[in-house]
């Protein structure tokens, strides 16, 4: 019968030819009267057997990621008869593996949106490193994950590849982040190859900002003829947060001469202060009111950042008209 | 890393002029506004100017209005405080500091999170 | 506008150290605080109230309410002998307290 052990021949050898194995039958007995033939897909070119001792060489410098395996048919004849000593046989040569291929990011590129004061913990997005290399050939292709920019903010689990947030971010203070993450094979020992992809981190508003008064004090004048419902002057906060979360809502905190009112003007989001009732100079000559300013709509977990809505205290100037 | 670099100080007699400079580097400059902040000798914070960060708008406290100009030249990296009609009560160590918050954003709610390490003016006569 | 701080707060290490800013309707505006070493320039350790910057440990804290704004450390340890600053906004302009000496005895 044949004798043979399992082939392996280890990818991109350099060498001219590599001795694989030794391909035999058990009625050889050395004196050189049997002859040995490979056939198949690669014999001849990829493979050659020494016709006498059966022993197989690799002639050219094989890849496992092309190729992993080849199956050649072996056959042994008696040179003096030219009859096959044993049945063809099928057997395999398999390409074992080196860690020739550094992991590769196929995704990319990454882009994540995350709500600003996120928690600690609170995931954003998971990135995947590929490794051609054979996961079963030792640690080739096992992958270990670490970050290379964007600490202290977030944090990548290491056999994973997820991204965490690892400290609250402000988005008013930045608003998005470059994040940069190695993925090393040979988890991580020495030999290993690595491939980094970056992660742009956008960061989506909540409303941590009240609106504040721009100035503390406004000055306004109204003239005594002007009828109710006139319009006589604006105030304005600021919000630094955007969309409906800088939707602001003004009111009057103090008028105790109840003569003024204050409407929100929803496009550009300012005060009006609005005449409520006629004003008469001989009467009162002057007033002082207090507005406040509140966001339309703060989610109950917001509220610490809006414990106190700012106010602005508006001087109104009454002019006189003269009278018949 | 991100640093901001006071030179320009010195001793100047009162009247006389002098021209503070803070340098950046770490940061876009552009996205930031500067603040210029002093402190005399064993006394507290003062705050001086502020400059947006496009140079747009400027505001400064009143005890330098009119005295001090503040600018920048966002080529360079550069913020200045141009001090003219010094006074012995000008006497302190100047700060530039970095206004945090984007650009769009207004106010001083989130403070001034990158300081320099300050130069000594001293006006005598 | 003006803010008024205490000129020094002394605190046990360990214990809880409270450094308070009082200012008209302070609690309507964002205040900032800062630590300043002697030699050093100020640092931020609060902002808005009540956020802290990167790398400010969390056991520096703020609150801001009606005309009191308060600095809270907790576990106070040496390294936190300091100068400290609170900071607010008004009309356009920036405006310090007279600053609190915090001696940890």
């Known amino acids: 019968g044949w004798v043979w052990n399992q082939f392996f021949v280890p990818e991109e050898m350099n060498t001219t030819s590599h001795h694989i194995g030794q391909l035999r039958s058990d009625l050889d007995n050395g004196n050189n009267s049997f002859q040995y033939k490979l056939l198949g897909a690669g014999a001849g070119s990829t493979f050659i057997i020494d016709e006498r001792t059966g022993d197989i060489y690799a002639i050219q410098k094989l890849d496992r990621e092309e190729r992993s395996l080849y199956i050649l048919r072996a056959q042994v004849i008696d040179i003096a008869t030219g009859r096959a000593v044993e049945p063809e046989s099928e057997f395999v040569i398999k390409v074992s593996d080196i860690n020739d291929n550094e992991p590769k990011f196929l995704d990319e590129p990454y882009e994540a949106i995350v709500p600003e004061m996120s928690p600690e913990g609170t995931l954003v997005i998971q990135v995947t490193a590929s490794d051609a290399d054979d996961p079963s050939s030792g640690n080739n292709a096992r992958l270990l994950y670490s970050l290379l920019q964007g600490q202290p903010y977030f944090s990548v689990e290491p056999t994973t590849g997820v991204i965490r947030i690892s400290s609250k971010m402000d988005r008013e203070l930045q608003d998005e982040y470059w994040v940069i993450i190695q993925a090393k094979d040979m988890i991580g020992q020495p030999g290993a190859l690595s491939g980094t992809t970056s992660v742009l981190i956008k960061l989506s508003d909540v409303n941590d900002n009240k609106p504040i008064f721009k100035e503390s004090l406004y000055r306004l004048t109204v003239s005594e003829s002007a009828p109710t419902g006139t319009s006589i002057g604006t105030i304005m906060a600021y919000d630094n947060d955007i969309g409906e979360n800088a939707e602001m809502d003004y009111s009057i905190e103090e008028d105790d001469s109840q003569t003024f009112d204050i409407i929100t003007n929803h496009e550009t989001q300012e005060g009006i202060v609005i005449l409520k009732k006629k004003v008469d100079f001989e009467h009162q000559n002057h007033y002082g009111i207090r507005a406040k300013v509140k966001n339309h709509h703060v989610p109950e977990q917001l509220m610490k950042y809006h414990t106190e809505a700012s106010t602005t205290f508006i001087k109104i100037q009454v002019e006189d008209v003269d009278e018949p | 890393q991100v640093q901001l670099v006071e030179s320009g100080g010195g001793v100047v007699q009162p009247g006389r002029s002098l021209r503070l400079s803070c340098a950046a580097s770490g940061f876009t400059f552009s996205r930031y506004g500067i603040h210029w902040v002093r402190q005399a000798p064993g006394k507290g914070l003062e705050w001086v100017a502020v400059i947006w960060y496009d140079g747009s708008n400027k505001y400064y406290a009143d005890s330098v209005k009119g005295r001090f100009t503040i600018s920048r030249d966002n080529s360079k990296n550069t913020l200045y405080l141009q001090m003219n009609s010094l006074r012995a009560e000008d006497s302190a160590v100047y700060y530039c500091a970095r206004r945090a918050g984007i650009p769009g954003t207004t106010g001083y709610y989130y403070g001034m999170d990158v300081w320099g390490q300050g130069t000594t003016v001293t006006v005598s006569s | 506008y003006e803010l008024t701080q205490p000129p020094s707060v002394s605190v046990s290490p360990g214990q809880t150290a409270s450094i308070t800013c009082s200012g008209d309707r302070l609690g309507e505006k964002y205040v900032s605080w800062y630590q300043q070493k002697p030699g050093q320039s100020p640092i931020l350790v609060i902002y808005?109230?009540?956020k802290w910057p990167s790398g400010i440990p969390e056991r520096f804290s703020g609150s801001n309410s009606g005309n009191t704004a308060t600095l809270t450390i907790s576990g106070t340890q040496a390294m936190d002998e300091a100068d400290y600053y609170c900071q607010a906004w008004d009309s356009s302009t920036v405006v310090f307290g007279g600053g609190t000496k915090l001696t940890v005895l």
């Open positions: 808005q109230d009540n």
